[in-house]
Interface confidence: low
């Protein structure tokens, strides 16, 4: 079998809301993946599991099942959303994210994603990790070409 390539493209959008009483930030982060099938047969993308970390703490997880199949020598772009919550011991971030006098409220998040593909009964997992800046102070949509600009570190091999 030839390789199945997973490329994390970046954050597509981040939608934010707040709970003033609980000093809590809710961020729905939509990410984009490109999955390329370099084989001469179809493969199934069985599931995508993702999690987001802030300051080494997991703040959100998501799992998508039975997503799609990818034809021979084909590529599919898949968006997935991870709902995240910044609260409790990280509630100090509430002040930063709601501070009106600065224009960009960037926080550094680690995006972790694992894609499970199957073909002929064989299962393969491919993982990526990427640090990204996300604006926690407003709803933001990013151009896909912009994502590389947002990358702080290259993915770990």
């Amino acid at each position: 079998p030839r390789s199945i390539d997973v490329k994390y493209i970046g954050v597509k959008s981040a939608y934010v809301s707040y709970d003033v009483q609980k000093r809590t930030i809710y961020l729905n982060i939509t990410n984009t993946l490109n999955i390329t099938n370099n084989n001469y047969y179809s493969v199934e993308v069985e599931n995508i599991t993702a999690q987001v970390q802030f300051a080494k703490t997991v703040i959100g997880k998501a799992r998508l099942n039975n997503i799609t199949h990818i034809g021979p020598l084909d590529m599919k772009q898949i968006d997935y959303t991870v709902p995240t919550v910044i609260a409790e011991e990280m509630s100090y971030m509430y002040d930063f994210c709601t501070l009106i006098s600065i224009k960009v409220h960037n926080i550094v998040l680690m995006m972790q994603v694992t894609v499970t593909t199957t073909y002929f009964g064989h299962s393969e997992q491919i993982s990526q990790e990427r640090y990204q800046y996300v604006d926690c102070g407003r709803n933001t949509t990013y151009q896909l070409g912009q994502s590389e600009y947002l990358n702080v570190l290259q993915p770990q091999q």
């Epitope: 100090y92 002040d95 930063f96 709601t98 501070l99 009106i100 006098s101 600065i102 960009v104 550094v108």
Partner: antibody, heavy 118, light 113 residues
């Protein structure tokens, strides 16, 4: 140890521009905003503007637009301020400072004295 | 622009005394989103850069002695120094930390009697 090391004092003639620097160390340069503040003799502190090293974004006090230009070189973790069309009014001590969670600078450079004199 | 007005412009004190200085802003510095007041206090000694003492109107910066206390809300703020020490002699500035352009008061100079 967090440090903002500014360039030395300068004595310049009226007219030509001057560029002063602020080298950061001891923290992640692109995570902070770098502010510039002017202290004139017998006057209060005046906020000139800020630059965000992460993307080069700037915000100026309207009063200093056209007078000051703020830039960064992330490869050397250095912020720069260029002052043009110099007059005696520009004679002052200029400070760089950093902020993160708010706009209260917690670390300041030692200051650069600019003297404009013919 | 938000105008910051400090009073008095100078204060003469003896060591051990308690002093208060005032700062008024032309607009409220209260952020309704999180109910915090965005005002800072700085201390500046001759030949030195300003030093952050208080932010958020009342939160002491780490390492700042607890004899420095910030209070107030909205447009009226106060810095109190109890048991003044000789090393406290300096100019004290308040700063609008709420919106651009950031603005400073003219300062209150603390002198020895």
């Amino acid at each position: 140890e967090v440090q903002l090391q500014q360039s030395g004092p300068v004595l310049v003639k009226p007219g030509p521009p001057v560029k002063i620097s602020c080298k950061a160390s001891g923290f992640t340069f692109t995570d902070y905003y770098i502010h510039w503040v002017k202290l004139s003799h017998g006057k209060s502190l005046e906020w000139i503007g800020l630059v965000y090293p992460y993307n080069g974004d700037t915000d100026y006090n309207q009063k200093f637009k056209g007078k000051a230009t703020l830039t960064v070189d992330t490869s050397s973790s250095t912020a720069y301020m260029e002052l043009n069309s110099l007059t005696s009014e520009d004679s002052a001590v200029y400070y760089c400072a950093r902020t993160y969670y708010a706009n209260s600078p917690d670390y300041w450079g030692q200051g650069t004295t600019v003297t404009v004199s013919s | 622009d938000i105008v910051m007005t400090q009073s008095p412009s100078s204060l003469s004190v003896s060591a051990g005394e308690k002093v208060t200085m005032s700062c008024k802003s032309s607009q409220s510095l209260l952020n309704s989103g999180n109910q915090r007041n965005y005002l800072a206090w700085y201390q500046q000694k001759p030949g030195q850069p300003p030093k952050l003492l208080i932010y958020g109107a009342s939160t002491r910066e780490s390492g700042v002695p607890d004899r420095f206390t910030g209070s107030g809300s909205g447009t009226d703020f106060t810095l109190t120094i109890s048991n003044v020490q000789a090393e406290d002699l300096a100019v004290y500035y308040c700063q609008n930390d709420h919106s651009y352009p950031l603005t400073f008061g003219a300062g209150t100079k603390l002198e020895l009697k």
